[in-house]
């Protein structure tokens, strides 16, 4: 059984204010069963950026259809980028548990930074 890897290919993503940013995340295995969430930052204070199951994320859309059983692409798009969006973003796999899901593995993170405006 292949051990799950969380792949975030870009270490650094330069974005432009007002544009849409795509944060890539793919997994190498469908197991263990459980959701993938997106966070900004690390530690107790990390901010929830996207949770497929619940929550309000008006500026976030998924690149793929996460409801498909064999989906392995958990990339997201964040629209209308502002300077307040800079930071390091992590996709994190949780293992389905009872009563609560348990964090299983995190991607290495993608740092989103503002790039120069196109001239």
């Amino acid at each position: 059984e292949e051990e799950l890897q969380m792949i975030q290919p870009e270490k650094l993503l330069l974005v432009t204010v007002g544009k849409t940013a795509t944060l890539h995340c793919t997994v190498t295995s469908l197991l263990p069963v459980g959701p993938v969430l997106w966070f900004r930052g690390v530690g107790p204070g990390r901010e929830l950026i996207y949770n497929q199951k619940e929550g309000h994320f008006p500026r976030v859309t998924t690149v793929s259809d996460l409801t498909k059983r064999n989906n392995m692409d958990f990339s997201i798009r964040i629209s209308s980028i502002t300077p307040a969006d800079v930071g390091t973003y992590y996709c994190v796999k949780f293992r389905k548990g009872s009563p609560e899901n348990v964090e299983f593995k995190s991607g290495p993170g993608t740092e989103m930074a503002l790039g120069a405006k196109p001239s």
């Epitope: 969430l37 204070g45 990390r46 901010e47 609560e100």
Partner: antibody, heavy 117, light 108 residues
Framework: DVQLVESGGGLVRPGESLRLSCAAS????????VTWVRQAPGEGLEWVSL???????YYADSVKGRFTISRDNSKSTLYLQMNGLRAEDTAVYYC???????????WGLGTLVTVSS | EIVLTQSPGTLSVSPGERATFSCRAS??????LAWYQQKPGQAPRLLIY???TRATGIPARFSGSRSGTEFTLTISSLQSEDFAVYYC??????????FGGGTKVEIK
């Protein structure tokens, strides 16, 4: 505008219990960790407890086993259940929103807890 | 646990003057240090994080710097509303989140 409003403070005797609430508005409560910080009369700030967006809880050693932090995302409310209260728990209790940088960017006005016989 | 020591305990400054006070960490915290301002009867307010990044809405007269484990908050020209207690907080090693004991800036 972000608002945090604490309630539930009051005067209790040593050994008794109290439940503090913090009603949050002006931000998406479910997306952020929230915390309690206290300040004894004339003293500095002391971090008490934090609950993450996934529900993981953290406590200062001074309150571990006596205090329980919880959140109700449907009500955008943070709670602190305080049992076995001691005189040294007397303080103003503030709730605060936690940023992804692990700093506290918005604070409530606080609620006073007095433990005295 | 990281211990933060603030000095001086009290600083007497005249309005318009420069105020500088420090926070020393017992071990390395990188640049992960924040400063808060608290006026009497009010909640603390976040001023600076990451040692030198001003929080939203904080005036440019507030600036932070770092030299190893010693951090400094400078108020370039004290306004009447700046007389308050200032606390540092480390945000690299948690839990616990630790605060310094505070520096009171009073009118000279």
């Amino acid at each position: 505008d972000v608002q945090l409003v604490e309630s539930g403070g009051g005067l209790v005797r040593p050994g008794e219990s109290l439940r503090l609430s913090c009603a949050a508005s002006g931000f998406t409560f479910t997306n952020y960790a929230v915390t309690w910080v206290r300040q004894a009369p004339g003293e500095g700030l002391e971090w008490v407890s934090l609950i993450s967006v996934t529900g993981t809880t953290y406590y200062a050693d001074s309150v571990k086993g006596r205090f329980t932090i919880s959140r109700d995302n449907s009500k955008s409310t943070l709670y602190l259940q305080m049992n076995g209260l001691r005189a040294e728990d007397t303080a103003v209790y503030y709730c605060a929103k936690v940023t992804w940088k692990n700093v506290f960017d918005y604070w409530g006005l606080g609620t006073l807890v007095t433990v005295s016989s | 646990e990281i211990v933060l020591t603030q000095s001086p305990g009290t600083l007497s400054v005249s309005p318009g003057e420069r105020a500088t006070f420090s926070c020393r960490a017992s071990q390395t915290v990188g640049s992960k240090l924040a400063w808060y301002q608290q006026k009497p009867g009010q909640a603390p307010r976040l001023l600076i994080y990451d040692a030198n990044t001003r929080a939203t809405g904080i005036p440019a007269r507030f600036s932070g710097s770092r030299s190893g484990t010693e951090f400094t908050l400078t108020i370039s020209s004290l306004q009447s509303e700046d007389f308050a207690v200032y606390y540092c907080q480390q945000h690299t090693d948690w839990p616990p989140y630790t605060f310094g004991g505070g520096t009171k800036v009073e009118i000279k």
